[in-house]
Interface confidence: low
């Protein structure tokens, strides 16, 4: 019984098109496939950024595969050919592994990168980003500011930068088409005179990112006794209702402060006959149901009840 | 967590040169330099050198420049230094220290390593 | 090479003091707007810890009440309230230029 052997997938490689972190793992047939013609071969492939505890595996009849990196570290990838055992009469066989690794040589000192990159997605609409210059550049350094997702030919340029003592130190974005749920890829680059200067990569989802405006209309309604309604009504703007979730703060004779969180644009508030003044304010923030995370709203204009019974007016902004 | 490890106390005698590793984990190796300090026993502190470990740069202080000799394992993320034609006055603690750049400091230290030059 | 001095080079304090530790180089250890001085704290038979880099940030972890000041050649390490845990030697050092150097050390003893 000879023993079944298979080799190594060939010219296994990481080849990077620019897209800021996007990357291709490709790679041809391992040599001699003749006597597995009848055969589909597989192959799995393992990779991830230099420094991560763990691989991702893929298992692919393909010659090709792309996924997103953080190209701030190094890749590395592996990959086997795999024999099902319906090929081989037996259990399945796995050639070596081929491997492979893609860097991009870090120019300049870690000082000379730009500090504290901060990206807000205003609304679910205007993408603002903004930096700080290194803490070891001089005042001729410049930035550049180059993102990609897919669905963009190429890495773009931002167009629109925000500017102080003549650098760029942020970059407003133009309308960002079918941006959402997908990898955003961003590098921040720069140029200088004196020295060279350390880009820095950065990748997140936008709708992760979202600064909602703070609600507006902020009403009271006496329900009975003892208890008020708080209404608000959700600012305008592409974010529907059901992706809110809610924070107010409820201040009752500049004593009592009641905070909660809720889902909905009501939330009903027990009090009693003696209140005599009541002030809330609301905040609002895209929910789990329509992203992984998101920022806080600024609170909302303030709403008072004072010196009238809350059970002959309702309140209007 | 960072972890810097330092190979076991040498004893060696004045002529001999002693090879003392630093094995990284816990972070990019890469990203980062590795700095060596000697501690004299009851002294402060001398800044031997560094070394990149992406690249294998390296910068010594003059006065170990011909005898401290840094080189990288990146393979096993481990920084040796090497030092030759020891002498008494070389016994001392050896530190490695974890560095990102100039301006960032030695943020990480491993446990130093106890060489002693008798005859 | 920079020269790096400190004072005291030692002091005796109690829990609660403030404590002010200071460095002066020799020549200026500020390039590109920063300043290249670090410090660090160290207890016996222990390595060194850093406390503070590029003169007045702090380590990652590291308590608020240490702090640190100056540039070009004069620095200073304050601990706003000394804790028992406190009583160590500092140095500073420059990292500005290769050699780097170190401080003679400051050791903060229990009065």
């Known amino acids: 019984d000879t023993e079944i052997k298979v080799n190594p997938p060939q010219d296994f490689e990481i080849v990077d098109p620019g897209y800021l972190g996007y990357l291709y793992l490709q790679w041809q047939p391992p040599l001699s496939l003749d006597h597995f013609k009848e055969c589909t071969v597989e192959y799995e492939l393992k990779y991830r950024n230099i420094g991560s505890e763990t691989w991702k595996t893929i298992i692919t009849k393909n010659l090709h595969y792309k996924d997103g990196f953080d190209l701030n570290k190094g890749i590395e990838a592996k990959i086997h050919t795999l024999l099902p055992w319906q090929c081989t009469n037996g259990s399945e066989v796995q050639s070596s592994w081929a491997e492979t690794t893609y860097w991009i040589s870090p120019q300049g000192i870690p000082e000379t990168k730009v500090q504290d990159m901060d990206c807000v997605y205003y609304n679910w609409q205007y993408l603002l980003c903004s930096w700080k210059p290194g803490i070891g550049v001089l005042l001729d350094t410049n930035y550049n500011l180059f993102y990609w997702y897919e669905g963009l030919d190429h890495a773009l340029q931002c167009v629109d930068y925000i500017k102080a003592d003549g650098q760029n130190i942020g970059c407003r974005f133009p309308y960002l088409e079918a941006s959402d749920y997908k990898d955003f890829y961003i590098c921040v680059n720069g140029s200088s005179e004196n020295k060279p200067i350390r880009s820095s990569y950065f990748t997140f989802q936008l709708q992760n990112i979202v600064k909602p405006l703070p609600p507006v209309y902020l009403t009271f309604t006496r329900e009975s006794s003892c208890e008020i309604k708080l209404k608000w009504s959700i600012p305008l703007g592409p974010i529907p209702a059901r992706c809110f979730d809610y924070e107010i703060e409820i201040r009752e004779d500049d004593t009592t402060l009641v905070t909660a969180t809720v889902e909905n644009e009501t939330y009903t508030l027990k009090t009693t006959n003696e209140t005599r003044q009541l002030c809330f304010v609301v905040r609002s923030k895209v929910n789990i149901y329509c992203s992984d995370d998101g920022i806080w709203s600024e609170w909302s204009d303030k709403q008072c009840w004072e010196g009238e019974d809350l059970s002959k007016k309702t309140l209007l902004r | 967590q960072v972890q810097l490890v330092q190979s076991g106390a040498e004893v060696v005698k004045p002529g001999a040169s002693v090879k003392l590793s630093c094995k990284a984990s816990g972070y990019t190796f890469t990203n980062y330099w590795m700095n060596w300090v000697k501690q004299a026993p009851g002294q402060g502190l001398e800044w031997i050198g560094r070394?990149?470990?992406?690249?294998?740069?390296?910068h010594y202080n003059q006065k170990f420049k011909d005898r401290a000799t840094l080189t990288v394992d990146k393979s096993t993320s481990t920084v040796y230094m090497e030092l030759s034609s020891l002498r008494s006055e070389d016994t001392a603690v050896y530190y490695c220290?974890?560095?990102?750049?100039?301006?960032?400091?030695?943020?990480?230290w491993g446990q130093g390593t106890l060489v002693t030059v008798s005859s | 090479d920079i020269q790096l001095t400190q004072s005291p080079s030692s002091l005796s304090a109690s829990v609660g003091d403030r404590v002010t530790i200071t460095c002066r180089a020799s020549e200026s250890v500020d390039n590109y707007g920063i300043s290249f001085m670090n410090w660090f704290q160290q207890k016996p038979g222990k390595a060194p810890k850093l406390l503070i880099y590029?003169?007045?940030r702090q380590g990652s972890g590291d308590p608020a009440r240490f702090s640190g000041s100056g540039s070009g050649t004069d620095f200073t390490l304050t601990i706003s309230s000394l804790q028992p845990e406190d009583f160590a030697t500092y140095f500073c050092q420059q990292s500005k230029e290769v050699p780097w150097t170190f401080g003679g050390g400051t050791k903060v003893e229990i009065k």
């Open positions: 070394i990149d470990a992406y690249a294998g740069e390296t």
């Open positions: 590029a003169a007045s």
């Open positions: 220290a974890r560095g990102y750049g100039d301006a960032y400091g030695m943020d990480h």
